[in-house]
């Protein structure tokens, strides 16, 4: 048992059917000695009484808020969660595998640009009686700190039957160094709370990994002269890092038909501009990677051709 | 060519050659995500390996101020990669495919560090750590680990030599 | 006061379903967990299993595990225990009982229902 | 699964004697052991849990000890009402077991 805040406690079970339950004594915060009962959640039923409580916690029914009274009077509270180990794994119910980039990815992260700053999201079917707690650091043994914002409900969506609810969480790094190589990985770390249920989701990942710019921007078509080629032009994106000349992209530009089986013509440039030739009912796009490093293309920025 | 003690390299051939690092440390190692190399500990592995990091002067205002740090720093990092490439990880089983791009990649990571000290001039270099997976599987491993570490490497580089050829050429 | 109350005795033919129920009150239903313990005539108790009120999650004793099944109704604080098909060694009283939370075992039974199972 | 033996499987006494019911568990149950009294025609009724707790309104002549795989149910002091048959149960590891039952008799 541990402390997950203030007289809040996770248990930690062993979950297969012949798992003794876990022992747990509850102590009562008081200097008083004599005429203490206790009670769960809203139940006035006594179940027990003294200083300690001792239980056995084995199933969610054992979980809840234990409350130790003295003369119809509230001393201190306890409230135990349960994380659930199956077969020497940690239980993750409460948040959904987002498959992408491989299986058991519970959180995603991506960042804009090197300044440290990092948005990390994950999917629930779950809709209430829902907690998360964001912790973060550049890494583990002599962490550097990292400061999250709280999560929240950042879309809902319909899957079939289900209705999917995303959680996100803004991140930045303390002292963060753009320019340098990263030597330690950020850690993420997610409390996740469901009822009495809890359960933790970490992601390690450096920030030049999880890269993702933002689609060029003010993308423009300039005709030329007596010739069905056209200028594309484009800026980088405001949130990418500056100066350009030390944190440069390079792009891709592309020519799309109507019908997505036309035959797409690609051009990959570092320049912020490229000669194409537009086809009728076509539509130019371009997007943008760090230059360097190989990490996620941005989204398309997209114009039609006439 | 760059003289150590203060004239500048060759930024734009520095520049050039840098980027060509870039585009065959991926085509070397393109299995980004595929396979994260952290899960497998990375303990005597990469934390040996020189990193630019943030006292290095390598930021574009660092190098305005004294490009010679930066550079110096480069330059072991570099002689390290081209000392791990050519060391019996890469040459042992399992032998590499015949068109690799890993000999190129030892030849340029060779050519950029030449580009930065010419015969004559010595910066001190990083001893590098005696590396010997008994398995085949641990030179595997350890190649994979040390491509995706370069692959960080000469993107900063990379970037150095790109701000310095745009704003630090004469 | 805690009270489970328990439905009337039943005689079956092999072969029928039954459902019997077990309707608590007096106490927080959400709070505790129902069981069902068995007693076959003149013999010792059998544990069959505990449900939770909340979001039917159950433990089975492997040897009932596919021979009855537990089910619960939030709404009326009722249990109910069933069999697709009966057989004449499902002949026996039940309890339904509940299960005091951070222990395990029974504090407070229903008076029991007699199942008779016979051709 | 546990397997819960109880001795005797009959016991003797008078009222106003001292009855002694031992349980045995096939391997350790901690202290998470219980026991019942079951009346004829009545259902069971908690004595003591966790070994040696009375339950709530249970007459204080009634005691538990014992853990591990031991455990000891006493009367100090046998009342008419109290000729029954006691059984124990472990509730430490599924599926939750009862022991065979004592009958405690007028002797």
């Known amino acids: 048992i541990w402390e997950l805040k203030k007289d809040v406690y996770v248990v930690e079970l062993d979950w297969y059917p012949d798992a003794p339950g876990e022992m747990v004594v509850l102590t009562c915060d008081t200097p008083e000695e004599d005429g203490i009962t206790w009670t769960l959640d809203q139940s006035s039923e006594v179940l027990g009484s003294g200083k300690t409580l001792t239980i056995q916690v084995k199933e969610f029914g054992d979980a809840g808020q234990y409350t130790c009274h003295k003369g119809g009077e509230v001393l201190s509270h306890s409230l135990l969660l349960l994380h659930k180990k199956e077969d020497g794994i940690w239980s993750t119910d409460i948040l959904k595998d987002q498959k992408e980039p491989k299986n058991k990815t519970f959180l995603r992260c991506e960042a804009k640009n090197y300044s440290g700053r990092f948005t990390c999201w994950w999917l629930t079917t779950i809709s209430t009686d829902l907690t998360f707690s964001v912790k973060s650091s550049r890494g583990s043994s002599d962490p550097q700190g990292v400061t999250c914002g709280a999560a929240t409900l950042s879309a809902e969506r319909v899957r079939g039957d289900n209705k999917e609810y995303e959680y996100s969480v803004e991140c930045q790094e303390d002292s963060a160094c753009p320019a340098a190589e990263e030597s330690l990985p950020i850690e993420v770390m997610v409390d996740a709370v469901h009822k009495l249920k809890y359960e933790n989701y970490t992601s390690s990942f450096f920030i030049r990994d999880i890269i993702k710019p933002d689609p060029p921007k003010n993308l423009q078509l300039k005709p030329l002269k007596n010739s069905r080629q056209v200028e594309v032009s484009w800026e980088y994106p405001d949130t990418w890092s500056t100066p350009h000349s030390y944190f440069s992209l390079t792009f891709c530009v592309q020519v799309q038909g109507k019908s997505k089986r036309e035959k797409k013509d690609r051009v990959f440039t570092d320049k912020t501009s490229a000669t194409v030739i537009c086809r009728k009912n076509a539509s130019i796009s371009v997007r943008a990677q760090d230059r360097y490093y190989s990490s996620s293309w941005s989204e398309w920025a997209s114009v039609p051709c006439s | 060519r760059a003289v150590p003690g203060g004239s500048s390299p060759a930024w734009t051939q520095c520049q050039q050659l840098s980027q060509k690092l870039c585009t065959l440390a991926w085509s070397a190692h393109p299995l980004v995500g595929h396979m994260d190399l952290r899960e497998e500990g990375d303990e005597e592995t990469t934390n040996d390996v020189p990193h630019i990091q943030c006292g290095d002067g390598c930021d574009p205002q660092g190098l305005r101020d004294n490009s010679q740090f930066c550079l110096q720093r480069i330059h072991q990092g570099l002689i390290f990669y081209e000392k791990l490439l050519g060391s019996d990880i890469f040459t042992g089983e399992p032998s590499l495919l015949p068109d690799s791009p890993v000999g190129q990649l030892h030849a340029s990571l060779l050519g950029l560090s030449q580009l930065l000290q010419p015969e004559g001039h010595h910066w001190e270099t990083q001893q590098i750590p005696s590396l010997s997976p008994s398995q085949p599987w641990q030179r595997l491993l350890l190649r994979f680990k040390i491509l995706r570490s370069l692959q960080a490497f000469v993107a900063v580089a990379a970037r150095v030599f790109a701000h310095g050829a745009a704003t630090l050429s004469p | 006061e805690v009270q489970l109350v328990q439905s009337g005795a039943e005689v079956k033919k092999p072969g029928e379903s039954l459902k019997i129920s077990c309707q608590s009150s007096g106490y927080s239903f959400t709070t505790y967990w129902i069981g069902w313990v068995r007693q076959m005539p003149g013999q010792g108790l059998e544990w069959i299993g505990i449900?939770?009120?909340?979001?039917?999650?159950?433990r089975y004793n492997p040897m009932f595990r596919g021979q009855v099944t537990m089910s619960v109704d939030k709404s009326s604080s009722t249990a109910y225990l069933q069999w697709s098909s009966l057989k004449a060694s499902d002949t026996a009283m039940y309890y339904c009982a509940r299960r005091r939370p951070g222990q395990g075992y029974f504090d407070f039974w229903g008076q029991g229902t007699m199942v008779t199972v016979s051709s | 699964e546990i397997v819960l033996t109880q001795s005797p499987a009959t016991l003797s006494a008078s009222p106003g004697e001292r009855a002694t019911i031992s349980c045995r568990a096939s391997?350790?149950?901690?202290?998470?052991l219980a026991w019942y009294q079951q009346k004829p025609g009545q259902a069971p009724r908690s004595l003591i849990y966790?070994?040696?707790n009375l339950q709530s309104g249970i007459p204080a002549r009634f005691s538990g000890s014992g853990s591990g795989t031991d455990f000891t149910l006493t009367i100090s002091s046998l009342e008419p009402e109290d000729f029954a048959v006691y059984y124990c149960?472990?509730?430490?590891?599924?599926?939750?077991?009862f022991g065979q039952g004592t009958r405690l008799e007028i002797k």
């Open positions: 449900m939770s009120p909340v979001d039917s999650d159950i």
């Open positions: 149960q472990q509730y430490n590891i599924y599926p939750y077991t």
């Open positions: 391997q350790s149950v901690g202290s998470w």
């Open positions: 966790a070994a040696s």
